[in-house]
């Protein structure tokens, strides 16, 4: 048993059929020492007496808020959540695996620059009943401070029969150089509690890799004379870190017709114009990624050619 | 239809294209490398990021951009110098700051070039012949390294009496390859910054 | 139960900005998830925003989505909604409410409710 929270604790239980389970010793935070009751969640059943309560940890029905009372007054609290081990493996019931980039990939994270600011979130299918804490660190030895927001619930969407909720939060780096050279990951912890279940996910990454520039801005199209070429221009998005001739993306510009099965025309660029032939119906996309690093190619910004 | 990019003109700041070709080469090794020795751990979640020039030279540091040392987080305890102006020492003069920020860069591939000689005559003695240093990657390292125009001592390759461990130097080989290219990202990104000053 | 008591209201202009506070009483605030609902007149009791046990997971109404800031200081057993921006139709009666762990959007998950206090906003 450990300290998640003040007041709330977790009981890791190997979880298999007729396990013996946990025996847990719960105190009450109180100098009194005589005439206390203990009751569990709602109910009114005294489950013991005295200052303190072993009890015997097995399944659910045995987590939730144990009160000691006095007369009639709340003295404290002690929360029980269970953590499960089913096969020497810690249960992942909570999220959902996002299969990408691979397997038992639960949290993703993606950053727009390279100030230490980033984003993760991630996926479950749980409605109610569902609490998250994040924290992060720059390496786990020696940890560096990385402070998180509270998550929040971002997007919900329907897939097939069930509905699927997305989480998020956002990240900052307490002391991040832009310049600098990560030799130590980013470390993300999320502990996840649905009901009185209790698991934890963590995720390990440079920023220079979930580097994912926003789309390009200000995308524009100059009809060039007698012809039916244009000049497609674009700006840095103003979320890209700066001084953009340090920090230099490269583009990619694409035309589509309106069928997608149509040949898709590409070029690939350092500068912030390109010139292209356009065709009718078809639609003009730029997309950026850090020029020298690959990481991720940013969301297309487009425009229709008529 | 992919169409590639156009190269600058190598004459306008000679240094910009070979740091650009440095680094296709590095990463092009670090592919093969990954490739080659995929039972081996070889991927940047797998090893340990070791900086082979840490205390050595301080390549971030003094290549700092002028609008980055306003940033406390990039001015570490390290006296911490920036660029200010000019290009490769082609042709304009330098300022001290530049020569600094270039001599830095200069001796972190005359190390990494010692370290990749002494591992690359290893890897030769290896009976499996698995994997070697790409000459074109080494030879790229001495065309920037000439293009810098830093007089210095040459350092002797490493020369080992014992046994090479081959297991050991394949892992010494991958994180080498994964700093170097970090390591060339900073170098590219510094001449294109001196190339637009 | 946990006893509360909401502070913090009044009359303010289009907007303009309050902060309402919601203390609890007891020691054992910590394992609470707190939220806040109002209800304007003739119209139900409508969720606002909600942070959980630790603060760790918060949810805002879309009508008050980026004008508005729930945090707790479990040191000073409090809860706290910072509104910005306000609207007319932000005018209402605001009440906290607590349920153990978990944060929740309906009134009917909350088991412990305070008085409520009078926010009005005037155009």
């Known amino acids: 048993i450990w300290e998640l929270k003040k007041d709330v604790y977790v009981v890791e239980l190997d979880w298999y059929p007729d396990a013996p389970g946990e025996m847990v010793v719960l105190t009450c935070d109180t100098p009194e020492e005589d005439g206390i009751t203990w009751t569990l969640d709602q109910s009114s059943e005294v489950l013991g007496s005295g200052k303190t309560l072993t009890i015997q940890v097995k399944e659910f029905g045995d987590a939730g808020q144990y009160t000691c009372h006095k007369g009639g007054e709340v003295l404290s609290h002690s929360l029980l959540l269970l953590h499960k081990k089913e096969d020497g493996i810690w249960s992942t019931d909570i999220l959902k695996d996002q299969k990408e980039p691979k397997n038992k990939t639960f949290l993703r994270c993606e950053a727009k620059n390279y100030s230490g600011r980033f984003t993760c979130w991630w996926l479950t299918t749980i409605s109610t009943d569902l609490t998250f804490s994040v924290k992060s660190s720059r390496g786990s030895s020696d940890p560096q401070g990385v402070t998180c927001g509270a998550a929040t619930l971002s997007a919900e969407r329907v897939r097939g029969d069930n509905k699927e909720y997305e989480y998020s939060v956002e990240c900052q780096e307490d002391s991040a150089c832009p310049a600098a050279e990560e030799s130590l990951p980013i470390e993300v912890m999320v502990d996840a509690v649905h009901k009185l279940k209790y698991e934890n996910y963590t995720s390990s990454f440079f920023i220079r890799d979930i580097i994912k520039p926003d789309p390009p801005k200000n995308l524009q199209l100059k009809p060039l004379k007698n012809s039916r070429q244009v000049e497609v221009s674009w700006e840095y998005p103003d979320t890209w870190s700066t001084p953009h001739s340090y920090f230099s993306l490269t583009f990619c510009v694409q035309v589509q017709g309106k069928s997608k099965r149509e040949k898709k025309d590409r070029v690939f660029t350092d500068k912030t114009s390109a010139t292209v032939i356009c065709r009718k119906n078809a639609s003009i996309s730029v997309r950026a990624q850090d020029r020298y690093y690959s990481s991720s190619w940013s969301e297309w910004a487009s425009v229709p050619c008529s | 239809r992919n169409l590639p990019v156009a190269t600058p003109d190598p004459g306008m700041f000679p240094c910009l294209h070979h740091s650009q070709n440095l680094l296709r080469a590095v990463s092009n090794m670090l592919q093969k490398a990954r490739q080659t020795l995929e039972f081996y751990p070889c991927t940047s979640e797998e090893i340990d990021h070791e900086d082979i020039t840490k205390d050595k030279t301080s390549t971030v540091e003094a290549c700092l951009p002028l609008e980055l040392t306003k940033n406390e987080s990039c001015l570490n305890s390290r006296e911490t110098s920036f660029i200010t102006n000019g290009s490769c020492l082609a042709s304009r003069k330098t300022s001290f700051m530049m020569a600094l920020c270039l001599s830095s860069i200069y001796e972190d591939l005359k190390m990494y070039q010692v370290e990749f000689k002494t591992m690359n005559a290893k890897l030769l003695m290896d009976p499996k012949r698995q994997i070697f240093l790409d000459q074109n990657m080494l030879a790229v390292i001495d065309e920037l390294m000439q293009a810098l125009n830093f007089n210095s001592e040459t350092v002797p390759q490493k020369s080992s009496l014992e046994e090479p461990d081959f297991y050991k130097t394949k892992i010494k080989l991958c994180i080498l390859l994964h700093a170097f290219r970090i390591r060339a990202v900073t170098i590219d990104r510094v001449m294109s910054y001196l190339n637009a000053s | 139960e946990v006893q509360l008591v909401e502070s913090g209201g009044g009359l303010v202009q289009a907007g303009g900005s309050l902060r309402l506070s919601c203390a609890a009483s007891?020691?054992?605030?910590?394992?609470?998830?707190v939220g806040w609902f109002r209800q304007a007149p003739g119209k139900e009791r409508e969720f606002v925003a909600a942070i959980s046990w630790g603060g760790g997971t918060v949810r805002y109404a879309d009508s008050v989505k980026g004008r508005s800031t729930i945090s707790r200081d479990d040191a000073k057993n409090t809860v706290y909604l910072q509104m910005n921006s306000l609207k007319p139709e932000d005018t209402a009666i605001y009440y906290c409410a607590a349920r153990v762990l978990h944060i929740a959007t309906k009134a009917v998950d909350f088991g412990s409710w305070g008085q409520g206090t009078q926010v009005t906003v005037s155009s």
């Open positions: 007891g020691r054992t605030f910590s394992t609470y998830a």
